[in-house]
Interface confidence: low
Amino acid sequence: KLTIESTPFNVAEGKEVLLLVHNLPQHLFGYSWYKGERVDGNRQIIGYVIGTQQATPGPAYSGREIIYPNASLLIQNIIQNDTGFYTLHVIKSDLVNEEATGQFRVYPELPKPSISSNNSKPVEDKDAVAFTCEPETQDATYLWWVNNQSLPVSPRLQLSNGNRTLTLFNVTRNDSASYKCETQNPVSARRSDSVILNVLYGPDTPTISPSDTYYRPGANLSLSCYAASNPPAQYSWLINGTFQQSTQELFIPNITVNNSGSYTCHANNSVTGCNRTTVKTIIVTELSPVVAKPQIKASKTTVTGDKDSVNLTCSTNDTGISIRWFFKNQSLPSSERMKLSQGNITLSINPVKREDAGTYWCEVFNPISKNQSDPIMLNVNYNALPQENLINVDEQLYFQGGSGLNDIFEAQKIEWHEARAHHHHHH
């Protein structure tokens, strides 16, 4: 069967296409090419008589067509109007006709696109930006690239106008990137130059560094302020509410206690119209801003109730500090048996009672800092049992209970035997 193959099928403007004939019959008289899907004398391009090898142009001949002896037709310098169907009409020697139709499509060679923007300096969380890929080209596909990667999926990104327009809603600083558009059709693909999206933002809340609050007299105070901002923020400093200077750094040499106060950094972005402040308290003092952890020393940690006394000492190398004592989360002293001395350094318990058993710790502090010791455990034992708890029956001692002694009975069998011997000795 007679067929026509277009090579290529999609043709770029200005290029050429070959309408290649397959299965051409033998014993031909001649053939003709027509523009369109049917034989129409008014749309004949060219005719060819084999016997005379004569080619005759028809009404649709443009001067760009060449016919070959094998009936194939070459069309050069293709124009948009050439798109469509072409019909070959073959006349055999027996005057029986045969027809075949082929087609091709013509596309423009795409120009390099460019990006137009409706907002060259959008403000973060406020503005939208619409990029449009120019020019508008029929039958072209539009693609977008961000930092040379395909568009991320985001509810803030919207494609419209046949993907020719990319809109970013509520832009953020992270949208600051390189944007390109690409146009494609079956015969070409072109990419634009980058457009850099410049999102204006900030200032964010400023950070004052270093983070120190306490300084010694005579030190140099050097504070730096930074706030993320585009364009960069302009900074100013206030001390106790009074303007000092318009710089990013504040330097005060040889400070005194009079330099204590509130230090405010003010960051301003004149383009976004926003400003932010951070306040930092500076304290100039001889006192140590870090109190070392104190240690407790005990005269003994296991004592006999109603008999022994104990001294607990809170040791610290810091000066200008105060000391307080705690027992089972209660502040001491809590009874007349407890005495504090040497500026609360020493806690004396005399005599020790059963209820004094437990954990003790001390805390050292000054007006700006404090620290606690590790706890120390005080154990209280009873070596002698009170008389009223013992009954003498046939020289045997029996425990009668009462006064909570039952609690320590099992733990104090040795002391019990010692008490028996002690009791016998006195009777």
């Epitope: 060259s120 390189s178 980058s194 410049n198």
Partner: nanobody, 118 residues
Framework: EVQLVESGGGLVQPGGSLRLSCAAS????????IGWVRRAPGKEEELVAS????????RYADSVKGRFTISADTSKNTAYLQMNSLRAEDTAVYYC???????????WGQGTTVTVSS
């Protein structure tokens, strides 16, 4: 994310030289124009120099012509500003910026301080 990071600022005596660097990320400097903007207290902001790598176009402010040279290394994605014969009036914070042929500038770095003082 587009970022510009400047370096190379410092204290220099009048007549001395400095070379500022601007390392770009998030885009290709060959696709656009890069410039240096300076900001000094009490003075107008000034675009001192810019270079458009794709066209080879450079421009300089009159105040720095013949003293400053802008260049770019596309393989390092970095722009440079060579500053010679520095004067006290060149003292400023210098920002790297993305610019245009027309001298507009928008996307800024965070700046590097140049102090010219004896």
């Amino acid at each position: 994310e587009v970022q510009l990071v400047e370096s190379g600022g410092g204290l220099v005596q009048p007549g001395g030289s400095l070379r500022l660097s601007c390392a770009a990320s998030g885009f290709n400097i060959k696709d656009t124009c890069i410039g240096w903007v300076r900001r000094a207290p009490g003075k107008e902001e000034e675009l001192v120099a810019s270079i458009c790598q794709y066209s080879g176009y450079t421009r300089y402010a009159d105040s720095v012509k013949g003293r400053f040279t802008i260049s770019a290394d596309t393989s390092k994605n970095t722009a440079y500003l060579q500053m010679n014969s520095l004067r006290a009036e060149d003292t400023a914070v210098y920002y790297c910026a993305i610019t245009s042929h027309h001298g507009d500038y928008n996307y800024w770095g965070q700046g590097t301080t140049v102090t010219v003082s004896s």
